[in-house]
């Protein structure tokens, strides 16, 4: 099928495009084209005789264009005008016709933008600043770039009129900013200049610096006054309220206790007409004041809060020092001076940071101490502790319950018995209890400061029998000749007497056992293997008297000294060499054969079949405890002897 | 071997008192609680109280509270019983008992008794 | 008090065969204990701590319960069994006895 193609088919003005003819049929007798999408004589561009290689123009021919014999039309110099459909009439030598049409669009080659803007010198958090990008232009696209970087989302920037007009609504200091816009159509792209956006703005509160407030008579006072401003701030100083000059800086060589007094920095913004002043209050010493200490926090909470203490006044060129508990600070990374030493950081305080702190001020001649300082850390509650301890109780006793919790400020406490509340007192008292006072006893203690609060929970048996009692143990699995083991008789109770038997027999003497806590524990220092036995311990009173199941001790020990058995050393060449080892441990040890300090296998025997004289060496057994961490080893020398050489020589296995 | 000796049988009359004694051998009283139960004639057993010899410490059942009064003397290694205001209802065995360990066993030993007869 | 009541009162059985007698609790309590009582002399412990047996007393006997309920048990009758059994509970004051349960024998 015939078709025409525009290249290109978006044609600049100026520059030239060529309708290109594809699928052109042959035995052509000739070819026309027209402008628009039909045959129209009145809007005929050229014709072309095949047989004459004749081109004849037409009533649209403009001069500009050229055909060529593949059909093909080349428009030179194209116009805004040409834009548009173009038809192709092709007459075939059966004078049949055939038609196809083209099209391509016009566009102007766009000038080099510019921004124009309503204010040159908008004023921060009041003016609003609308760019707009020149000239307009039809059909052209426009975009924005801000620091070369495509517009940032913000509710404060709005496109308008076609995206040609940016407005900034209650600009701010950090629109200053390099703006570009930019123009596009199908056939070009152009960038303006960077306009930059000048925000008028400040001054803000101004700093005097230094920070130090303190001084020594005889020092040269200079202060210097900035304020974020633009334009840049005029500055002006005041001394206890009167005018002194016009500058940046202050200075005041060799002060006395005069120069005492308010210093005011005023910074003055000429454009936005905006005033602001700082005031800092300098004191001259006629000699180191007593130093004091300011905390940042009055009451910091124990693992969570941090605490700086700086030593009052601050003055230049003075040594600053520390004292924690009457002593030097100590090694901790929870202790942190500043460059001047003249405040301390305590990170994470603990109830154990609560000091008393003192600062000193170097001079000359002495050390100036400021008064001590106590942190009054919050803490706690930790766990409450019910006393006594007994769990049984006999009816018609009194009851008297105490709890205790570490906690600053002091805890405050409940008593809640099943889970019902009875009181809220650190005491609680029952006179003539019955076994109906059994039951769930706990202790509430809340810290008000810090709103957390514990519970420890108690369970009370009143009864005048006594349960069967129970062993409990510090250490399961003692390492023999290092750890000590205590056994403690359950459960607790009044007027009770403890009782402890080894293997059904009364306790021996040894220095190793000691009763403690009313013979309730037994504890048995440095534990060795023939301590693993069966220990019971039995409770009486005014009613029952009962035995504990036995608990027996498992004490790791070893590995001794291993044993390689059979004991011979010499062996016949061509017989079985069969050795085990054994070595007392608990647990059972893992074994491991070497050779000539060559690693061989991880068992208990090793076996080696029809040995030679190349089997003569060093036989070592190696004996590892995992539990206790302990190895042993021993060494054993095999001599083989080939068969026949010497009498009296193992046969082997 | 552990043994509770008890005085022997008393005749008295209603209104009067009376104070049996339990003595211990083969161990000491001071470390063991001495209990006392009454048996009527043909009738079942009836605590009466304990006392802890070490300290005096006692704990009587209701019923004998004013009626019966517990002592001891280490010294002697004897525990007593003190029936006080005596009537025909305080006729019967007095028994002396006390639940010790005995090497590893916890073994109950009991006196013989100690029959008392109050007559009008 | 807690009151300990036996059933049967009386009973007899003859040898061989098995026993039961029980021991029931007003109020709960931690263990039971059995005493053993023969004409003319003084009691002797039979059962502690509910399921334990005195030194002495032969396999045959046994003790169970918990709670209130609580029984003694002879496998197979003998004659020197026949005698009265009393339960003890001492929970709590007063240590209070049931009224005894006697056991004769066929």
């Known amino acids: 099928k015939l078709t025409i193609e525009s290249t290109p088919f978006n044609v600049a003005e100026g520059k030239e495009v060529l309708l290109l003819v594809h699928n052109l049929p042959q035995h052509l007798f000739g070819y026309s084209w027209y402008k628009g999408e039909r045959v129209d004589g009145n809007r005929q561009i050229i014709g072309y005789v095949i047989g004459t290689q004749q081109a004849t123009p037409g009533p649209a021919y403009s001069g500009r264009e050229i055909i060529y014999p593949n059909a093909s039309l080349l428009i030179q110099n194209i116009i805004q005008n040409d834009t548009g459909f173009y038809t192709l009439h092709v007459i075939k030598s059966d004078l049949v016709n055939e038609e196809a049409t083209g099209q391509f669009r016009v566009y102007p080659e766009l000038p080099k933008p510019s921004i124009s803007s309503n204010n040159s010198k908008p004023v921060e958090d009041k003016d609003a600043v609308a760019f707009t990008c020149e000239p307009e232009t039809q059909d052209a696209t426009y975009l924005w770039w801000v620091n070369n970087q495509s517009l940032p989302v913000s509710p404060r920037l709005q496109l308008s009129n076609g995206n040609r007009t940016l407005t900034l609504f209650n600009v701010t200091r950090n629109d200053t900013a390099s703006y570009k816009c930019e123009t596009q159509n199908p056939v070009s792209a152009r960038r303006s200049d960077s306009v930059i956006l000048n925000v008028l703005y400040g001054p803000d509160a101004p700093t005097i610096s230094p920070l130090n407030t303190s001084y020594r008579s005889g020092e040269n006072l200079n202060l210097s006054c900035h304020a974020a401003s633009n334009p840049p701030a005029q500055y002006s100083w005041f001394v206890n309220g009167t005018f002194q000059q016009s500058t940046q800086e202050l200075f005041i060589p060799n002060i006395t206790v005069n120069n005492s007094g308010s210093y005011t920095c005023q910074a003055h913004n000429s454009d936005t007409g905006l005033n602001r002043t700082t005031v800092t209050t300098i004191t001259v010493y006629a000699e180191p004041p007593k130093p004091f200490i300011t905390s940042n926090n009055s009451n910091p909470v124990e693992d969570e809060d941090a605490v700086a203490l700086t030593c009052e006044p601050e003055i230049q060129n003075t040594t600053y020092l520390w004292w924690v508990n009457n002593q030097s600070l100590p090694v901790s990374p929870r202790l942190q001076l500043s460059n001047d030493n003249r405040t301390l950081t305590l990170l994470s305080v603990t109830r154990n940071d609560v000091g008393p702190y003192e600062c000193g001020i170097q001079n000359e001649l002495s050390v100036d101490h400021s008064d001590p300082v106590i942190l009054n850390v919050l803490y706690g509650p930790d766990d409450p502790t019910i006393s006594p301890s007994y769990t049984y109780y006999r009816p018609g006793v009194n009851l008297s319950l105490s709890c205790h919790a570490a906690s600053n400020p002091p805890a405050q406490y409940s008593w809640l018995i099943d889970g019902n509340i009875q009181q809220h007192t650190q005491e609680l008292f029952i006179s003539n209890i019955t076994e109906k006072n059994s039951g769930l006893y706990t202790c509430q203690a809340n810290n008000s400061a810090s709103g957390h609060s514990r519970t420890t929970v108690k369970t009370i048996t009143v009864s005048a029998e006594l349960p069967k009692p129970s062993i409990s143990s510090n250490n399961s699995k003692p390492v023999e000749d290092k750890d000590a083991v205590a056994f403690t008789c359950e459960p607790e109770a009044q007027n009770t007497t403890y009782l402890w038997w080894v293997n059904g027999q009364s306790l021996p003497v040894s220095p190793r056992l000691q009763l403690s806590n009313g013979n309730r524990t037994l504890t048995l220092f440095n534990v060795t293997r023939n301590d693993a036995r069966a220990y019971v311990c039995g409770i009486q009173n005014s009613v029952s008297a009962n035995r504990s199941d036995p608990v027996t001790l498992d004490v790791l020990y070893g590995p001794d000294t291993p044993i390689i058995s059979p004991p011979d050393s010499s062996y016949l060449s061509g017989a079985n060499l069969n050795l085990s080892c054994h070595s007392a441990s608990n647990p059972s040890p893992q074994y491991s054969w070497r050779i000539n300090g060559i690693p061989q296998q991880h068992t208990q025997v090793l076996f080696i079949a029809k040995i030679t004289p190349n089997n003569n060496g060093t036989y070592a057994c190696f004996v590892s405890n995992l539990a206790t961490g302990r190895n042993n080893s021993i060494v054993k020398s095999i001599t083989v002897s080939a068969s026949g050489t010497s009498p009296g020589l193992s046969a082997g296995a | 071997e552990v043994q509770l000796q008890q005085s022997g049988a008393e005749l008295v009359r209603s209104g009067a008192s009376v104070k049996l004694s339990c003595t211990a051998s083969g161990f000491n009283i001071k470390d063991n609680y001495m209990h006392w139960v009454k048996q009527r004639p043909e009738q079942g057993l009836e605590w009466i109280a304990w006392?802890?010899?070490?300290?005096?410490?006692?704990e009587y059942a209701p019923k004998f509270r004013g009626k019966a009064t517990l002592t001891a003397d280490s010294s002697s290694n004897t525990a007593y019983l003190h029936l006080s205001s005596l009537t025909s209802e305080d006729t019967a065995v007095y028994y002396c008992?006390?639940?010790?360990?005995?090497?590893?066993?916890?073994?109950?030993?009991w006196g013989q008794g100690t029959s008392v007869a109050v007559s009008s | 008090q807690i009151v300990l009541t036996q059933s049967p009162a009386i009973m007899s059985a003859s040898p061989g065969e098995k026993v039961t007698i029980t021991c029931s609790a007003s109020s709960s309590v931690t263990y039971m204990h059995w005493f053993q009582q023969k004409p003319g002399t003084s009691p002797k412990l039979w059962i502690y701590s509910t399921s334990n047996l005195a030194s002495g007393v032969p396999a045959r006997f046994s003790g169970s319960g918990s709670g209130t309920s609580y029984s003694l048990t002879i496998s197979r009758m003998e004659a020197e069994d026949a005698a009265t059994y009393y339960c003890q509970q001492r929970s709590t004051y007063p240590l209070t006895f049931g009224a005894g349960t006697k056991l004769e024998i066929k």
């Open positions: 006392i802890d010899p070490e300290n005096g410490d006692t």
């Open positions: 008992h006390v639940l010790i360990y005995a090497g590893y066993l916890a073994m109950d030993y």
